[in-house]
Interface confidence: low
Amino acid sequence: DFGLDCDEHSTESRCCRYPLTVDFEAFGWDWIIAPKRYKANYCSGECEFVFLQKYPHTHLVHQANPRGSAGPCCTPTKMSPINMLYFNGKEQIIYGKIPAMVVDRCGCS
Amino acid sequence: DFGLDCDEHSTESRCCRYPLTVDFEAFGWDWIIAPKRYKANYCSGECEFVFLQKYPHTHLVHQANPRGSAGPCCTPTKMSPINMLYFNGKEQIIYGKIPAMVVDRCGCS
């Protein structure tokens, strides 16, 4: 698997992973104790025909071109967890691994 | 996990799995011996805020709203393989399990 990495200066128009720091304090998410911010990253860009397609299925749907199929879109294809310390609904402090919080790779699907 | 199933008569505008039969003969993919056609399905529809979101990350990116982030899109969240008999590049007949050929579930990511 392969994915492009870009930054805010990139001229790349295709599907790419961009840096994004999520700041829980800025969102007012005061139930999160730690981390207060983390590098989440996000996916953005065009999905031209066969570029970074994760699945052969994507190519086949493009060929068949059914009503309403919008073509592939740029979306996370590999994600990883982060460890978080937070209050749950019962005001208990929980330490846990929260899945799919960081985008490691972007692709077209 | 949960996903909607629709058909061509559905009035559902949200992210949904639709039936699609892929016909290899119609594509001129003559290197595929069997199956000649199979039920692939595809994803289509709107991803309104938090509907069928697969990852918490999707919600966070929506909150942070970075330059160029396009919002979640309707994409396969569960896929399965099919067994295929085909010619490889060396004209050898191969029987193998090809991953991610069938969409089992759609979601917003």
Epitope: F2, F49, L52 | -
Partner: antibody, heavy 124, light 107 residues
Framework: QVQLVQSGAEVKKPGASVKVSCKAS????????MHWVRQAPGQGLEWMGN????????NYNQRFKARVTMTTDTSTSTAYMELRSLRSDDTAVYYC?????????????????WGQGTLVTVSS | DIQMTQSPSSLSASVGDRVTITCKAS??????LSWFQQKPGKAPKSLIY???RLVDGVPSKFSGSGSGTDFTLTISSLQPEDFATYYC?????????FGQGTKLEIK
């Protein structure tokens, strides 16, 4: 076979516009980016931009951005490049070129088919 | 924009010679470089992509090498039909930029 056939030579006055066409045949037009490249007489090649017929998304060289528009007509498998406010230094041969994408990496492509070129002469 | 500098700008050689044309990028472009051949009055023709991969149908006497900022095109044994102008192109980022060309002439 895959072919790109461009419109004929044009002579234009400074300040006018020109619209060059590039008709594709022998392949699925919507599936491949079309690029436009120009070449002034006796000079090198200059990339102008591209368009993806599948969704109409285009990328322009900043140098031309204010004056160029690339469009496609999928019903006729034709790409168009319009250049406005023509100047004498826009005199050039304009080429369309298909970007052939064979893989999944960002550089897994090349220009496999070119149009024959359209000479645009800007002269008062 | 990424600047592509080709050298030499012109080159005289004889049939049977081995010639090398170089292309230097103003910044790292990985292996995202193509080479073209152009004959007078004709459209360019792709020879090499991704720095060293030969386009289908192009004879193996053409070869490419390099990565990062320095690239070369080599023609191992010149034939009369090889006398033309050669261009490199970086496709690492927009705008795509070409070298200024190398004119290969018969000595």
């Amino acid at each position: 076979q895959v072919q790109l056939v461009q419109s004929g030579a044009e002579v234009k006055k400074p300040g006018a516009s020109v619209k060059v066409s590039c008709k594709a045949s022998g392949y699925s037009f919507t599936g491949y980016f079309m690029h436009w490249v120009r070449q002034a007489p006796g000079q090198g090649l200059e990339w102008m931009g591209n368009i993806y017929p599948y969704n109409g998304v285009s990328n322009y060289n900043q140098r031309f951005k204010a004056r160029v528009t690339m469009t496609t007509d999928t019903s006729t498998s034709t790409a168009y490049m319009e250049l406005r406010s023509l100047r004498s230094d826009d005199t050039a041969v304009y080429y369309c070129a298909r970007r052939y994408y064979y893989g999944t990496g960002p550089a897994d492509w090349y220009f496999d088919v070119w149009g024959q070129g359209t000479l645009v002469t800007v002269s008062s | 924009d990424i600047q592509m500098t080709q050298s030499p700008s012109s080159l005289s050689a004889s049939v049977g010679d081995r010639v090398t044309i170089t292309c230097k990028a103003s910044q790292d472009i990985n292996s995202y470089l193509s080479w073209f051949q152009q004959k007078p009055g004709k459209a360019p023709k792709s020879l090499i992509y991704r720095a060293n991969r030969l386009v289908d149908g192009v004879p193996s006497k053409f070869s490419g090498s390099g990565s990062g900022t320095d690239f070369t095109l080599t023609i191992s044994s010149l034939q009369p039909e090889d006398f033309a102008t050669y261009y490199c192109l970086q496709c690492d980022e927009f705008p795509l930029t070409f070298g200024q060309g190398t004119k290969l002439e018969i000595k």
